[in-house]
C-alpha cells in the first residue's frame, strides 16, 4: 500500500510547482491505493472505496444498464413499455446528454483560448505539432490494425448469409451519396465558419439538387447549414483567438483571466454533473438495448463483424496505446487508465467524444496530474481530430463489405482505405454516428458497394460506443504523453517555456476550503492562478 501524500503543518498534502507555475500533489502518478495498491485494514478499504466511489458507481452503472436493458427487453421491450413509459425510461439518460452538451461550448472555447494564451508561440507550436503527430500515428496504427484483423478473421465471408435476409436491394438510400471532394471541401469550410454564433449549433454541408440544364439532368452541389455544432470551427477559432490575445501582451491579460475564470466555473459545473453521470449512463445504456429490435438475430448474423470491431478496439486500447505511453513515459499506463474510468464509461454511455470532454478534462487533471494548460489545449483538439476508434471501425467495415460482396482488395486499395480512413476520421468531429457517414467516403474511394451500409448501421449503436471509448482514451493518453514531454523539456531547460498568466493584484495566499459539489473532495486554493490542490482524489494514483 502506498502511503498517503505527505502533509504539511496545516494538514494539506505537500505540493510541488507544476509546469504552469501551479501546485500539484507530489508525484500523483505514484499514489496507488486503487490503481493496483492493496487495501488492507478496514480504514484503508473505506478510504479506497471513498477515493474511487465515482469510478465504481460508473462501472456498476454500465453493468446495471446492460442488465436492466436485457431484463426489460426480455419482458417485452419497447412494445411492452409503450411510448409514454419508454420516453420516461429514456429521460434520465437524455438529461445527462443535455447537461454534457450544455457545457461543451463554454468549455471548449474558454479552455482553448486560455490554453493557447497561456503558452508562448514556440511551445504552442511544438505542443500542437507533437499532439497532431501522436494523433496521426495512432490513427494510422488503428486503421492498419482494423484492416489486418478483418483480413485475418474474414467477418464478411462469415456474415454473407445476412445478404439473404436483408435482400438483394440492400438499403442504398440510407447511404449518403456525397462526392469525396465535396466532403473534404466541407471540412475546410467548417474550419473557417462564416458565423461564429451559428457555428455553436450549425455546420456547413453540401447536398445535391438535380437541375435540367439544356435538356440534360445535372447534379448541382448546393451548400447549406445543417443542425449540429461545428466544433472544428470553434476549436480553430479559439486557438487563433488565444494566440491573438497572447500577442496583445498586458492589454490581453484581463481577457485571458476572464476566460480562465470562466473555465474554472465551468469545471465546477462539470464536477457536479459527474455525480449524476452514473444514473444517466445506466439509463442511456439500458434504453438503447430496449430500443433495439431483434438483438439476438443481429448478433448471430453480424457476430464476427462485431467481434472484429470490439477485438480491434480492445487490442488498440489495452495494448497498442498503453505500450506507446509506456515506451515514452516509462510509467504504468494502466494506472493512468484507471484515473479516467469515469469518462471512459461516460463515452460508452453517451457515444460522443465531445460530450465526454468535460469529464475527461477534470479526470486527467485531478487524477493523472496533467497540467491544466495542456489538458485544456490538447483534449478539445483530440476530441475533434483524433478518432482512432472511428478509423479502426471504418477499416473493418470496408473490408467486411468487400468480403460480403466478394470484391477484391489489392494492395493499392488497402492503402487507399488506410489513408482515407485516417483522413476522413478527422471530419467525423465527435458527432455520434459520424463514422458511418464517413464510411461512405471510404467505400466510394475504393469502388465498394454502399448497399451494405444499412448492415453497419444496424449494429452501430454498439460499435460506435466502443469507438468513442477508444477515441477519448487516445485523447487522454496523448495529453499524458505531452505532459511527460513538457516535464522532460522543462527539467532540461532553466527557462520555463510554459508561462502562467500572472495576476496584477496580490491575493491572499492562505488556503480557503471550497466545496465543488463533490462530497468527497475538499479543494484548497493556492495563490491566484495556481492549480487546485485536492486533499483526496477521486482516483488515488
Amino acid at each position: 500500500m502506498v502511503a498517503d501524500p505527505p502533509r504539511d503543518s496545516k494538514g494539506l498534502a505537500a505540493a510541488e510547482p507544476t509546469a504552469n507555475g501551479g501546485l500539484a500533489l507530489a508525484s500523483i502518478e505514484d499514489q496507488g491505493a486503487a490503481a493496483g495498491g492493496y487495501c488492507g485494514s478496514r480504514d484503508q478499504v473505506r478510504r479506497c472505496l471513498r477515493a474511487n466511489l465515482l469510478v465504481l458507481l460508473t462501472v456498476v452503472a454500465v453493468v446495471a444498464g446492460v442488465a436492466l436493458g436485457l431484463g426489460v427487453s426480455g419482458a417485452g421491450g419497447a412494445l411492452a413499455l409503450g411510448p409514454e413509459r419508454l420516453s420516461a425510461f429514456v429521460f434520465p439518460g437524455e438529461l445527462l446528454l443535455r447537461l454534457l452538451r450544455m457545457i461543451i461550448l463554454p468549455l471548449v472555447v474558454c479552455s482553448l483560448i486560455g490554453g493557447a494564451a497561456s503558452l508562448d508561440p514556440g511551445a504552442l507550436g511544438r505542443l500542437g505539432a507533437w499532439a497532431l503527430l501522436f494523433f496521426l500515428v495512432t490513427t494510422l496504427l488503428a486503421s492498419a490494425l482494423g484492416v489486418g484483423l478483418a483480413l485475418a478473421l474474414q467477418p464478411g465471408a462469415a456474415s454473407a448469409a445476412i445478404n439473404a435476409s436483408v435482400g438483394a436491394a440492400g438499403s442504398a438510400e440510407n447511404a449518403p451519396s456525397k462526392e469525396v471532394l465535396d466532403s473534404f471541401l466541407d471540412l475546410a469550410r467548417n474550419i473557417f465558419p462564416s458565423n461564429l454564433v451559428s457555428a455553436a449549433f450549425r455546420s456547413y454541408s453540401t447536398t445535391y439538387e438535380e437541375r435540367n440544364i439544356t435538356g440534360t439532368r445535372v447534379k448541382v452541389p448546393v451548400g447549406q447549414e445543417v443542425e449540429g455544432m461545428n466544433i472544428l470551427g470553434l476549436v480553430v477559432f479559439a486557438i487563433v483567438f488565444g494566440v491573438a490575445l497572447r500577442k496583445l501582451g498586458p492589454e490581453g491579460e484581463l481577457l485571458i483571466r476572464f476566460f480562465n475564470s470562466f473555465n474554472e466555473a465551468t469545471m465546477v459545473l462539470v464536477s457536479w454533473i459527474m455525480w449524476y453521470a452514473p444514473v444517466g449512463i445506466l439509463f442511456l445504456v439500458a434504453s438503447k438495448i430496449v430500443e433495439m429490435k431483434d438483438v439476438r438475430q443481429l448478433f448471430i448474423s453480424l457476430g464476427k463483424y462485431i467481434l472484429c470491431c470490439l477485438l480491434g478496439h480492445a487490442i488498440h486500447g489495452l495494448l497498442v496505446l498503453p505500450l506507446i505511453y509506456f515506451l515514452f513515459t516509462r510509467k504504468n499506463p494502466y494506472r493512468f487508465l484507471w484515473g479516467i474510468v469515469t469518462p471512459l464509461a461516460t463515452a460508452f454511455g453517451t457515444s460522443s467524444s465531445s460530450a465526454t470532454l468535460p469529464l475527461m478534462m477534470k479526470c486527467v487533471e485531478e487524477n493523472n496530474g496533467v497540467a491544466k494548460h495542456i489538458s485544456r489545449f490538447i483534449l478539445p483538439i483530440g476530441a475533434t481530430v483524433n478518432m482512432d476508434g472511428a478509423a479502426l471501425f471504418q477499416c473493418v467495415a470496408a473490408v467486411f463489405i468487400a468480403q460480403l460482396s466478394q470484391q477484391s482488395l489489392d494492395f493499392v486499395k488497402i492503402i487507399t482505405i488506410l489513408v482515407t480512413a485516417t483522413a476522413s476520421s478527422v471530419g467525423a468531429a465527435g458527432i455520434p454516428a459520424g463514422g458511418v457517414l464517413t464510411l461512405a467516403i471510404i467505400l466510394e474511394a475504393v469502388n465498394l458497394p454502399v448497399d451494405h451500409i444499412s448492415l453497419i448501421l444496424a449494429v452501430d449503436w454498439l460499435v460506435d460506443r466502443s469507438c468513442t471509448v477508444l477515441n477519448v482514451e487516445g485523447d487522454a493518453l496523448g495529453a499524458g504523453l505531452l505532459q511527460n514531454y513538457v516535464d522532460r523539456t522543462e527539467s532540461r531547460s532553466t527557462e520555463p517555456e510554459l508561462i502562467q498568466v500572472k495576476s496584477e493584484l496580490p491575493l491572499d495566499p492562505l488556503p480557503v476550503p471550497t466545496e465543488e459539489g463533490n462530497p468527497l473532495l475538499k479543494h484548497y486554493r493556492g495563490p491566484a492562478g495556481d492549480a487546485t490542490v485536492a486533499s483526496e482524489k477521486e482516483s488515488v494514483m
Epitope: 440492400g170 442504398a172 466478394q406 458497394p449 448497399d451
Partner: antibody
Framework: QIQLVQSGPELKKPGETVKISCKAS????????MSWVKQVPGKGLKWMGW????????IYGDDFKGRFAFSLETSASTAYLQINNVKNEDTATYFC?????????????WGQGTTLTVSS | DIQMTQTTSSLSASLGDRVTISCRAS??????LNWYQRKPHGTVKLLIY???RLHSGVPSRFSGSGSGTDYSLTISNLEQEDIATYFC?????????FGGGTKLEIK
C-alpha cells in the same frame, strides 16, 4: 482462358423441376461471385441474384424468391440454378455470369445461355 | 430500383459509320455504368465497364462516356461483326438493372 459452360436446352411441363448447371474454368472459382440473369424472348435482361462462391450463400432478387434456388459444387467449380414448380412465365434463356470483383456490380464473363421452354 | 432507359430500340447505320447509343438512368449512378453486346442467338460479352474502361480483348473502336444519369457508347468505325444488340447496365446499387437494349442493323 476464362469460360463459363452451361448445360443444354430444357423442355419442361408446368409443375416440374429444372436444374441448370454452369461450369467455370480458367480462374479460381471461389474468388468471384456467380450471378444468374434471365432473358425473356424479345425482352431485356433481368438480374435474378447471385451466389457468394466463397461462403456458399445465395442472394435472390425480389422477383426470384421462393421457387428459385442457387447452389454450388465447389470441387467441380460448378454453379447451379434450380427452378421448382416451373410455370409458363419461366420460359426464357438463363445466363450464368461471373460477377467482377471490382467496380461494384458488373459481369465480366457470361455463359452461352440455357433455353428453358415450359409447355404443357 | 434504378430504371435504365435506352430510348432507341433499333438503329440503322452503314459500315464505317460512327455510331452512338445512349442510355439514361433514373438517378445518379456515379459512373457505375457498363455496356454489353449480345450477338443474335449468341453469348453476351462485356464491352465497357465503369463508364469508359475497355474490357480486355475489346477493340479500341468501342468507347464510353457520360456522368450522372446520362451515358453513351460510341463505335467509331462500324464493322460487320458489330451487328448485335447492345445493353447498358447500372452497377451502382443492388439490384443491378439493364436497359431494354438497342438493336444495331446495317443500312
Amino acid at each position: 482462358q476464362i469460360q463459363l459452360v452451361q448445360s443444354g436446352p430444357e423442355l419442361k411441363k408446368p409443375g416440374e423441376t429444372v436444374k441448370i448447371s454452369c461450369k467455370a474454368s480458367g480462374y479460381t472459382f471461389t474468388t468471384f461471385g456467380m450471378s444468374w440473369v434471365k432473358q425473356v424472348p424479345g425482352k431485356g435482361l433481368k438480374w435474378m441474384g447471385w451466389i457468394h462462391t466463397y461462403a456458399g450463400v445465395p442472394i435472390y432478387g425480389d422477383d426470384f424468391k421462393g421457387r428459385f434456388a442457387f447452389s454450388l459444387e465447389t470441387s467441380a467449380s460448378t454453379a447451379y440454378l434450380q427452378i421448382n414448380n416451373v410455370k409458363n412465365e419461366d420460359t426464357a434463356t438463363y445466363f450464368c455470369a461471373r460477377r467482377s470483383d471490382n467496380y461494384r456490380y458488373f459481369f465480366d464473363y457470361w455463359g452461352q445461355g440455357t433455353t428453358l421452354t415450359v409447355s404443357s | 430500383d434504378i430504371q435504365m432507359t435506352q430510348t432507341t430500340s433499333s438503329l440503322s447505320a452503314s459500315l464505317g459509320d460512327r455510331v452512338t447509343i445512349s442510355c439514361r438512368a433514373s438517378q445518379d449512378i456515379r459512373n457505375y455504368l457498363n455496356w454489353y453486346q449480345r450477338k443474335p442467338h449468341g453469348t453476351v460479352k462485356l464491352l465497357i465497364y465503369y463508364t469508359s474502361r475497355l474490357h480486355s480483348g475489346v477493340p479500341s473502336r468501342f468507347s464510353g462516356s457520360g456522368s450522372g444519369t446520362d451515358y453513351s457508347l460510341t463505335i467509331s468505325n462500324l464493322e460487320q461483326e458489330d451487328i448485335a444488340t447492345y445493353f447498358c447496365q447500372q452497377g451502382h446499387t443492388l439490384p443491378p438493372t439493364f436497359g431494354g437494349g438497342t438493336k444495331l442493323e446495317i443500312k
